[in-house]
């Protein structure tokens, strides 16, 4: 007789990543009877919400409901109706909302309140909206990539099931770059984590992990650019800012009020004799790199060694997955290949930044000018952050893997967040079952 497929016994989960520049909704799916196994959860959908990050709605909170509608309706379509009530929905807000909360806790709470009200109208099991800490963001990103790479599985394999697999149980470090913050997370080699704030202890699948993590608020690519502009305009002789981080021939008018809107530029704030200034690109990688380095204070370190701004950083250890904007920017610049050395990346950046703006616009006609104009800065910033900020070298550069997806799931903090909140990463190794339940009769 013909084998008949039984109804799929699966579960779903939804996580919204409310970042500083935009919100993305992720839908995850896993077999119900295997929730404690490692590597069984996978992403089935990503929906990018049209518009800016939720922190930008502070003066128009009544628009938040409409803003979230399309992606929530998409979730309603993707997940079978019979599963709606059992599907948890989590929203985690990151550095954009951390910055808003620094400015005004009341305004941040108002945004979160309206987000919660809006999301609760959908037929899912809404589990709340909150601002996650930088430490959580780093930790969950580390959990995500190691879960997807199979690093928590105790079974050693003679074959590779995922890219980047070094066929051992050494975990990967996680490098995450957002618009408003950046995180570095890894297991140091036999090194005491000198600063308690940067230490995490996990027991996952029967193994203990001592993890270092730090989140640098204001050092995401967008806020770093605001910082650089605020720093550089201080010494400008007039309302023209000749900027090496933008292509030759590029021009853009910036409002001083916009520049000083973010808490990230407070340290550079001064009274200027003009309300606006014009950025004029001169496209020089080396000068851009030098300007960016001035954002990193390396003169003070109360520990055996630091990243920058007096923040402890142990010696780098092992391979690293660099994701989010690290990946998006390097992918655009065609620099994600394992074969491209750090010297080659620097050479390519020099050439790219020197290209005239008109030429760039023609070559990348389909790309929005706002984003296109900032790739020279972003690429240079990534190099500066990794080399001077985190102390990667030309030799250790080959240990950085620019990762967008692993096994079809986006690298980022959202999967780790959901795995934790749904208790799907056990502290102890689950008892192995020799046979899984067959889905056929």
């Amino acid at each position: 007789t013909q084998n008949k497929a039984l109804p799929e016994n699966v579960k779903y989960g939804i996580v919204l990543d409310a970042g500083s520049s935009h919100t993305s909704l992720y839908i995850y799916k896993w077999p119900a009877e295997k929730e404690n196994d490692t590597g069984v959860v996978h992403q089935v959908e990503e929906c990018r919400v049209k518009g800016p990050g939720i922190s930008k709605f502070v003066q128009k909170v009544n628009e938040i409901g409409i803003y979230l509608t399309d992606c929530m309706e998409r979730a309603r379509e993707v997940i079978p109706r019979s599963q709606h009530q059992e599907t948890p929905v989590y929203l985690g807000a990151t550095a954009g909302m951390r910055l808003l909360r620094m400015e005004s806790e009341e305004l941040a709470d108002r945004v979160l309140d309206v987000v919660e009200r809006s999301l609760s109208n959908y037929p899912f099991d809404f589990q709340g909206a909150r601002i996650i800490t930088g430490q959580e963001e780093g930790a969950y990103g580390w959990i995500t990539i190691n879960y997807l790479l199979g690093k928590f599985s105790q079974k050693t394999r003679w074959f590779s099931i995922v890219p980047y697999e070094t066929n051992n149980q050494e975990t990967f470090g996680a490098l995450d770059l957002g618009g408003a913050s950046t995180q570095v997370t890894f297991v140091p080699q036999n090194q005491t984590i000198e600063s308690p704030d940067n230490a995490l202890q996990f027991r996952l699948y029967g193994k203990d992990y001592n993890v270092y993590t730090h989140s640098f608020l204001c050092y995401g690519k967008d806020q770093a650019l605001w910082q650089k502009l605020a720093k550089d305009i201080q010494v400008a002789s007039n309302e023209i800012l000749r900027d090496p981080c933008f292509h030759p021939g590029y021009k853009k008018v910036v409002n001083v009020s916009d520049l000083y809107k973010t808490p990230c530029t407070k340290r550079f704030e001064m009274t200027l004799p003009f309300q606006q200034f014009e950025i004029q690109g001169i496209g020089n990688y080396q000068q851009c790199h030098q300007s960016i380095l001035e954002l990193f204070n390396t003169s003070y370190c109360p520990y055996s060694q630091c990243a920058f701004n007096g923040i402890f950083l142990p010696p780098l250890q092992g391979d690293f997955g660099a994701f989010s904007a690290f990946y998006f920017v390097m992918k655009f610049l065609n620099l994600t290949s394992e074969k491209v050395s750090q010297e080659k990346v620097t050479e390519m950046m020099k050439k790219f930044c020197a290209q005239p703006w008109e030429e760039i616009k023609t070559s990348y006609a389909g790309v929005k000018e706002k984003y296109l104009s900032e790739y020279c800065f972003s690429g240079t910033y990534i190099l500066s952050l990794l080399l001077q900020g985190y102390h990667f070298t030309a030799d250790s550069w080959e240990h950085i893997h620019f990762i967008g997806k692993i096994q079809g799931s986006d690298a980022g903090w959202t999967l780790g967040y959901m795995l934790n909140l749904t208790n799907m990463i056990p502290a102890e190794q689950p008892l192995s079952t020799p046979l899984s339940h067959s889905t056929y009769v």
């Epitope: 909170v61 009544n62 938040i64 409901g65 009341e106 709470d109 108002r110 979160l112 309140d113 309206v114 919660e116 009200r117 809006s118 609760s120 809404f126 589990q127 709340g128």
Partner: antibody, heavy 121, light 107 residues
Amino acid sequence: QVQLVQSGAEVKKPGSSVKVSCKASGGTFESYGISWVRQAPGQGLEWMGSIIPEFGIANYAQKFQGRVTITADESTSTTYMELSSLRSEDTAVYYCARESGGYRDHRLDVWGQGTMVTVSS
Amino acid sequence: EIVMTQSPATLSVSPGERATLSCRASQSVGSNLAWYQQKPGQAPRLLIYGASTRATGIPARFSGSGSGTEFTLTISSLQSEDFAVYYCQQYLLWPLTFGGGTKVEIK
């Protein structure tokens, strides 16, 4: 001191709709939420939905989605709760109550006197 | 949704005695929990919020404790005006949910 004053008792036929009002006096709505809670005879309290009058943002319990509409008129400091497709099980006292704070602070610190709605053919 | 369960359904206590009412949440609500008192024919009245903070004008004989999933309302010495129905309510997540109530009656 804010007081919430509700409209009078209503008797309705099954299938019809009822609209109950709740007027804030002795203060303004500000950005407080207003929740609607009902209580069937001899039963417990059941939350129906909420609105932030300042923004007109409403959210509802899944049980009442599509059948309840909560609106607000800031000019008169009045909130309304309309329940449609009435059935006998909707016979209850309907209360409006002020939520004392914002994000995750939805304790109900001021209550209206209640409006008895009877659904009978 | 978060399910709130109160026990006992009815509590018979003599005036002057202590009454202890329990409330359990189906998942952690932190300290986002309120207690209300309701007398026949009246609207509920807020007694306790934040699991343990007395609302304005509430006598000191009413106290709340607990966090996470287990909560207690204690009335240290029952007065005649305290015989009523008491409800707990979580306000961590939407929908707001109430316990089924505990009726405190005269023994």
